[in-house]
């Protein structure tokens, strides 16, 4: 019962975690920033893995995908890859774990098979969670590094003067969603691995072999008739025990030299 509960809880926790990883990957609020400020209007910017949006205090909002941008940070591509790998592994893990659930009966699947599937899905959830946590952490590090590197400076460009503006930036909601979701997926995976130990039957290394008496174990008595080896009366000399397997000597009607006691 405890094993089933651990497995079920692990599945639910991982399911919530993977849903969170998907949500975080799709969210636009990975980082937020004030791009422009004056006494009348403010331009607020939020960026995701796939697009960047500007929102003004007037209510105007515009989002633009990064496909228009040349030279995206390599780190961004790495974060995208980590999040996608996390989602794919998590999805496969969920699929495997559904069939591994003890409360679901599929044909004559043995406990050992379910244990193996539970372990597999558990490992997949752990790796999925780690991918998400790594992806979010790499992004957070990239953000901090980039903002510290681009401190206020001014230089002369082709069209005049270029100045880097110091703006306030914060980690977006998606980072926290990603960290929590990755953690939940990781915990769910650990729970599945723990459940696997309880599911695996304690098998011995040998098989018990049972021996059955043959259906034609007979004794010879003077008078030439076949006596029964069974219990009770057998006046008609009928076969009392049939082991189920039909042998070659079963076709013989009379005792012969090949019949053994």
């Amino acid at each position: 019962m405890a094993v089933t509960a651990c497995q079920g809880l692990g599945f639910v926790v991982s399911l919530i975690g993977i849903a969170g990883i998907i949500a975080a990957t799709c969210m636009d609020q990975w980082s937020t920033q004030d791009l422009y400020n004056n006494p009348v209007t403010a331009v607020f910017n939020y960026q995701g893995l796939w697009r960047s949006c500007v929102r003004e205090s007037s209510g105007f909002t515009e989002c633009r995908g990064y496909f228009t941008l040349l030279g995206l940070p390599a780190m961004l591509q790495a974060v995208r890859a980590l999040m996608i790998v996390g989602i794919v592994l998590g999805a496969i893990g969920l699929l495997v774990s559904i069939f591994a659930l003890k409360c679901i009966r599929i044909g004559s699947m043995e406990d050992s098979a379910k244990a193996n599937m539970t372990l597999t899905s558990g490992i997949m959830f752990i790796v999925s969670g780690l991918c998400a946590i790594a992806g979010v952490s790499v992004f957070a590090n990239m953000l901090v590094t980039n903002f510290w590197m681009s401190t206020a400076n001014m230089y002369t460009g082709m069209g005049g003067m270029v100045q880097t503006v110091q703006t306030r930036y914060t980690f977006g909601a998606a980072l926290f969603v990603g960290w929590v979701a990755g953690g939940l997926t990781l915990i769910g995976g650990v729970m599945m691995c723990i459940a696997c130990r309880g599911l695996a039957p304690e098998e011995t290394n040998y098989k018990a072999v049972s021996y059955h008496a043959s259906g034609h174990s007979v004794a010879y008595k003077p008078g030439g008739f076949k006596a029964s080896t069974g219990f009770g009366s057998n006046t008609k000399n009928k076969k009392i025990y049939d082991g189920g397997a039909r042998t070659e000597d079963e076709v013989q009607s009379y005792p012969s030299k090949h019949d053994y006691v």
Epitope: Y36, E62, V162, Q166
Partner: nanobody, 120 residues
């Protein structure tokens, strides 16, 4: 790299009008805001007017009611229509373009400036 080019400056009589143009070109992700600043001889550079991508405008008190800033997002161009000009409006007018740089701090690009002289 973004190139900023101003035009439309010149000599104008007091009470007259002038229309300044500023075009941004080059490779950039998105222009967040464009504006005009001016610098009179021996003075600090001061804000005249700005306009955001969404069309929100802001005017300095000195030019309020006498100027109109407008923008063409498709052409990445900003215009400043100045009316009822006074001799104290004489200055070099600079165009400012704020560009969003994803995952970095935004950049401000400045033009070389266009001279506006209000004199009789």
């Amino acid at each position: 790299e973004v190139q900023v080019q101003e035009s439309g400056g010149g000599l104008v009589q007091p009470g007259g009008s002038l229309r300044l143009s500023c075009a941004a070109s080059g490779s950039f992700f998105r222009i967040v805001a464009m504006g005009w600043y001016r610098q009179a001889p021996g003075s600090q550079r001061e804000l005249v007017a700005t306009i955001t991508r969404g069309g929100s405008t802001y005017y300095a008190d000195s030019m309020k009611g006498r100027s109109t800033i407008s923008r063409d997002n498709a052409k990445n161009t900003v215009y400043l229509q100045m009316n009822s000009l006074k001799p104290e409006d004489t200055a070099v007018y600079y165009c400012n373009v704020r560009v969003e740089v994803p995952f970095m701090q935004p950049n401000d690009y400045w033009g070389h400036g266009t001279q506006v002289t209000v004199s009789s």
